[in-house]
């Protein structure tokens, strides 16, 4: 089951999947001035058997300047923008990551590929967030998001992360009541209305580090 939408956007943060669940699709996008080769794959697909997962199809780009009598398959604008990129950073796999059953690793780059990769995720996919350079992370909890199925619809959980400018000295934003965001808060089982479990976070400022303590004041 494909996830209907993109992982949540966190200001000044990028997200990355450490591994891709079987069923994930990666668009074969080419950089400006290049296009997919004639009869080339539209996307790569993570597939596998009980023991091994790998990417089916290969993306190949060729120069748009090349004359060819056969009409080329080119992506439509809506197709190109259907999924936002997960890769603002290097698409290379972290060397320390163990392979996971039922998951593919980051596919290697192909020649003349676009600068951004567009993935189509499936239910159960987990992505991880990091603040971009120049911003520091304030955590209410894990900086991750999971695509899950709820009441027949897919949604992404909300990462518990805020990225703040290095020079900002604001307290961790947990002393105010958390905003009732529809994503990432555990949903009630009796209805599809989303409820929020508020919790208070006390903060300390210590040198360059913010510390948040989960207190016992819960509702």
């Amino acid at each position: 089951e494909l996830c209907d939408d993109d992982p949540p956007e966190i200001p000044h943060a990028t997200f990355k999947a450490m591994a891709y669940k079987e069923g994930t699709m990666l668009n074969c996008e080419c950089k400006r001035g290049f296009r997919r080769i004639k009869s080339g794959s539209l996307y790569m697909l993570c597939t596998g058997n009980s023991s091994h997962s790998s990417w089916d199809n290969q993306c190949q780009c060729t120069s748009s300047a090349t004359r060819n009598t056969t009409k080329q398959v080119t992506p439509q604008p809506e197709e190109q923008k259907e999924r936002k990129t997960t890769e603002m950073q290097s698409p290379m796999q972290p060397v320390d990551q163990a392979s996971l059953p039922g998951h593919c690793r980051e596919p290697p780059p192909w020649e003349n590929e676009a600068t951004e990769r567009i993935y189509h995720f499936v239910v159960g996919q987990m992505v991880y967030y990091q603040c971009v350079q120049g911003y520091r992370a304030l955590h209410r909890g894990p900086a991750e998001s999971v695509c899950k199925m709820t009441h027949g619809k897919t949604r992404w959980t909300q990462p518990q992360l805020i990225c703040t400018g290095e020079m900002e000295t604001s307290q961790f934003p947990g002393e105010e009541k958390p905003q009732a965001s529809p994503e990432g808060r555990p949903e009630s089982e009796t209805s599809c209305l989303v409820t929020t479990t508020d919790f208070q976070i006390q903060t300390e400022m210590a040198a360059t580090m913010e510390t948040s303590i989960f207190t016992t004041e819960y509702q």
Epitope: K16, M18, P94, D96, Q97, A98, G124, M126, V127, Y128, Y129, Q130, C131, R136, A137, L138, H139, R140, G141, P142, A143, E144, V146, K148, T157, Q160, L161, F172, G184, P186, E187, S188, E189, T195, T197, F199, I201, T208, M209, E210, T211, S212, F214
Partner: antibody
Framework: QVQLVESGGGVVQPGGSLRLSCAVS????????IQWVRQAPGKGLEWVSV???????NYNSALMSRFTISKDNSKSTLYLQMNSLRAEDTAVYYC?????????????WGQGTLVTVSS | EIVLTQSPATLSLSPGERATLSCRAS?????MHWYQQKPGQAPRPLIF???NLASGIPARFSGSGSGTDFTLTISSLEPEDFAVYYC?????????FGGGTKLEIK
């Protein structure tokens, strides 16, 4: 290869202090959060604290006044300073790393270090 | 604080049998992680985000569930599967573990 090795455990009297260390290799503390989880003898797992990649920290509220988590990125070492120790703090203390960056699923664990608080 | 209640506390089965371990949350959570622990050893990652297998975990293990009810299933028990199993959530602060289910040989 990801490795976490705890040290610093031992026997300490009630009211005493102890500093646990967790030396990591195969990855950088600037990219991944590390958590401390403890387990009293014959009991279940209890979450203690986390220090995220960027340095911010969260604590178990029951322990926050006595325990302090810190790290030295250059030494690839994490610390847990435990003060005013009580008998109920007797446990094996594990440091653990999530699979992805500052994630919640603890995919890598150390072997643990035993802390015994006894007079 | 979300309390995770695992049941049964002890499950006695024979190799080859199917094991079903339950983890119930006091409030709805987004997903659940599972760990296996044997005596004298650190916990071993088993399943993440409810249903994804960890590295090196055989396909006889599976996870399912949503909301407040989550299940770890072992389709056909092998001798090495007898251990204590813990569920864990961090959808809501603070993160919590279940009390564990001890899977023992009948």
């Amino acid at each position: 290869q990801v490795q976490l090795v705890e040290s610093g455990g031992g026997v300490v009297q009630p009211g005493g202090s102890l500093r646990l260390s967790c030396a990591v290799s195969g990855f950088s503390l600037t990219s991944y959060g590390i958590q401390w989880v403890r387990q009293a003898p014959g009991k279940g797992l209890e979450w203690v604290s986390v220090i995220w990649a960027g340095g911010s920290t969260n604590y178990n509220s029951a322990l926050m006044s006595r325990f302090t988590i810190s790290k030295d990125n250059s030494k690839s070492t994490l610390y847990l300073q435990m003060n005013s120790l009580r008998a109920e703090d007797t446990a094996v203390y594990y440091c653990a790393r999530a699979y992805g960056y500052d994630g919640s699923w603890l995919a890598y664990w150390g072997q643990g270090t035993l802390v015994t608080v006894s007079s | 604080e979300i309390v995770l209640t695992q049941s049964p506390a002890t499950l006695s089965l024979s190799p080859g049998e199917r094991a079903t371990l339950s983890c119930r949350a006091s409030s709805s959570v987004s997903y659940m992680h599972w760990y296996q622990q044997k005596p004298g050893q650190a916990p071993r990652p088993l399943i993440f985000a409810t249903s994804n297998l960890a590295s090196g975990i055989p396909a006889r293990f599976s996870g399912s569930g949503s909301g407040t009810d989550f299940t770890l299933t072992i389709s056909s028990l092998e001798p090495e599967d007898f251990a204590v199993y813990y569920c864990q959530q961090w959808s809501s602060n603070p993160p919590t573990f279940g009390g564990g289910t001890k899977l023992e040989i009948k």
